[in-house]
């Protein structure tokens, strides 16, 4: 049956042509319509949907004077580096009035050497570890096969027939090379060569020898390193903070690590220089001439506690009568510990030595024996901790207290439990 | 042969919302442009707007600008004219109409009758 | 917007008369975009001649179209009592507007 107005005749007097080609190539579509009146915007569509960024050009050739006049209407669509993205069917479309036409289709297609999608990267692998390497490549034509190859060596006897998308290797003991080509119909595509880096082992067992307060003998045994002798390894401690929380596994410490090299073997390292009664996080990592492995899971470790390096400070010992009023301050020195107290000691001349431990206080009234005419009385006070005794300070001789002096009453070490008022007398 | 069937008739109060469809076949919807007429009891005819089928895009007249909007269901062949808060003027028969190449309206739809009351 | 001016607004014609009913437009337009309808009492509008001249399918050759500019007519040559309508011209040549019929 006859349309309502005939005016459903298509305006395309040229439609798009063909392009098949290889990967990279320049082509050009066209077409062709010829309109009475205003010529419309050509728009370009790809299978089914509008291009928005076409890189199209328009041009317009008036057959007359009249703006009823036929026009001649060319668009040209150009295809620069034809890549897979830009194959299928091409159709040119115009708005007319109130009404739609689409050219007859044009195809674009693609044929030629394969091209690679994936190609083995490099990468760093430990000795005698599996690991995968990718390849994939695409025509058309299809089919594409794919042969890979290690130092330059087939890996299978002919495309196709060995390992494809995915290549297992099950370990290497020195470093190589990986490749692949893609075969099809219309030749072959090498894919880049990929350098296989082949590094130690992580060293494992990683384990305390000794431990002195600012020293810690360490150990491990170390990885496989392929015909690679290990060069060294090195070792890392850093302090534990509290709220650090380094997992096995976080990547860095929070501060800069103390880092220690060692010449192998043997694997062992003594770290000097540390706190003492600190807790540590050590790791390791062994070299070769290919480089380092990975380092080994942070292990918390902690130096034991030592003796304090000096003795109390600052120490008077006062006498009046049968007391004496001696009093200290803590050292100086670091104490390599928790301070759990002082000793004293004091001796006459011609008497024993009276050892006291005075607890954490520091200060003590002393009740002496006898009338108190006991001569050239000296008094000594080390610190000590859990690991034991600190230096014994110097002795230090009783001085006689002097009217005017203040005379504070002081809890007698004979009556430890009596709580007292402290004056202070400095 | 081609045909363009709109839906029934509707009675509706001021201030509601009315929805009218218009169904083409015997042809490529997405070919044509769809526009919507208005004609109020014993008054000719008045252009709505239209809208391209293929793009979706909707172009209304000065005097259907606002409470007026037209849509497609493409898949269905079928575009819809709706009318927001509706007034006592917009009681009317509307029709759709399919558009050509040089702004004839070649079909039309048998129209809808939307009366509104309270 | 163009205002298209039809006359006469209202008009009674007999059998075998010729009938002609003029369109103004306010502005010149194309002749492409000039087209008539013709609306029977209870029915849908139906596309009558396009692009001034054109008969559209099943319309009887007794209708014919002519004009240009601003001024266009459309004329029954031989009145039927089928023909008993309202006849719409209509513009597409910028907004779109109908006659008053």
């Known amino acids: 049956a006859p349309r309502g107005t005939q005016a459903e005749e298509s305006p395309f007097v040229g439609n798009p042509g063909n392009i098949t080609g290889a990967r990279g190539l320049t082509g050009t579509l066209r077409c062709q319509l010829q309109v009475q009146g205003e010529p419309p915007e050509v728009h370009w569509l790809r299978d089914g949907q509008i291009l928005e960024l076409a890189d199209s050009t328009q041009t317009q050739v008036p057959l007359g004077e009249d703006e009823q006049d036929d026009w001649i209407v060319v668009s040209q669509l150009r295809i620069t580096s034809l890549q897979l993205s830009d194959t299928g069917q091409y159709q040119c479309l115009v708005f007319l009035g109130h009404q739609t036409f689409v050219s007859q289709p044009g195809y674009v297609g693609l044929e030629g050497l394969p091209y690679f999608l994936e190609e083995p990267e490099d990468r760093t692998v430990a000795a005698n570890t599996p690991f995968n390497l990718s390849c994939q490549a695409q025509g058309p034509p299809e089919p594409v096969d794919l042969l890979w190859l290690q130092d330059a060596v087939p890996l299978a006897t002919a495309p196709g027939h060995g390992p494809q998308r995915s290549l297992h290797v099950p370990g290497l003991n020195k470093t190589s090379s990986f490749s692949c080509e893609a075969h099809n119909a219309k030749g072959v595509t090498t894919s880049r060569t990929a350098t296989i880096t082949v590094l130690p082992q992580q060293p494992r067992n990683l384990h305390l020898v000794s431990r002195q307060p600012t020293e810690l003998e360490v150990a491990w045994t170390p990885g496989l390193s392929g015909i690679y002798p290990l060069t060294h390894c090195t070792l890392q401690a850093v302090l534990s903070d509290d709220g650090m929380g380094i997992q096995a596994g976080e990547p860095d410490p929070p501060e800069e690590p103390l880092t220690s090299q060692a010449s192998v073997p043997p694997h062992q390292l003594r770290l000097g220089s540390l706190h003492p009664h600190t807790p540590y996080h050590i790791r390791v990592a062994c070299t070769s001439s290919q480089g380092p492995s990975s380092w080994t899971h942070w292990l918390p470790v902690e130096t034991p506690e030592g003796v304090p390096l000096g003795p109390p400070e600052n120490i008077s010992a006062t006498r009046n009568g049968s007391q004496a009023f001696v009093h200290w301050q803590e050292p100086r020195a670091p104490l390599q510990g928790t301070l759990l107290g002082y000793r004293l000691a004091y001796q006459g001349q011609d008497t024993p030595e009276v050892l006291m431990d005075i607890g954490l206080r520091q200060e003590v009234t002393l009740e002496l024996q006898g009338d108190g005419s006991v001569s050239n009385l000296t008094v000594c006070v080390a610190a000590y901790t859990a690991a034991g005794d600190g230096p014994w300070s110097l002795p230090v001789p009783l001085e006689a207290w002097r009217p005017g002096q203040a005379q504070p009453v002081h809890q007698l070490v004979k009556e430890p439990s009596t709580p007292a008022f402290s004056w202070p007398w400095w | 042969q081609i045909q363009l069937v709109q839906s029934g008739p509707e009675l509706k109060k001021p201030g509601e919302t009315v929805k009218i469809s218009c169904k083409a076949s015997?042809?490529?919807?997405?070919?044509?442009?769809m526009n919507w007429v208005k004609q109020a009891p014993g008054k000719g005819l008045k252009w709505m707007g239209w809208?391209?089928?293929?793009?979706?895009?909707?172009t209304y007249a000065d005097d259907f600008k606002g409470r007026f909007a037209f849509s497609l269901e493409t898949s269905a062949s079928t575009a819809y004219l709706q009318i927001n808060n509706l007034k006592n003027e917009d009681m009317a028969t509307y029709f759709c109409?399919?558009?050509?190449?040089?702004?004839?309206?070649?079909?039309w739809g048998q129209g809808t009758s939307v009366t509104v009351s309270s | 917007e163009i205002v298209l001016t039809q006359s006469p607004t209202t008009m009674a014609a007999s059998p075998g008369e010729k009938i002609t009913i003029t369109c103004s437009a306010s502005s010149s337009i194309s002749s492409n975009y000039l087209h008539w309808y013709q609306q029977k009492p209870g029915f849908s509008p139906k596309l009558l001649i396009y692009r001034t001249s054109n008969l559209a399918s099943g319309v009887p050759t007794r209708f014919s179209g002519s004009g240009s500019g601003t001024s266009y007519s459309l004329t029954i040559g031989t009145m039927e009592a089928e023909d008993v309508a309202t006849y719409y011209c209509q513009q597409g040549s910028s907004i779109f507007t109908f006659g008053s019929g």
């Open positions: 809208i391209n089928t293929y793009t979706g895009e909707p």
């Open positions: 015997g042809y490529t919807f997405t070919n044509y442009g």
């Open positions: 109409a399919r558009g050509d190449r040089f702004y004839a309206m070649d079909y």
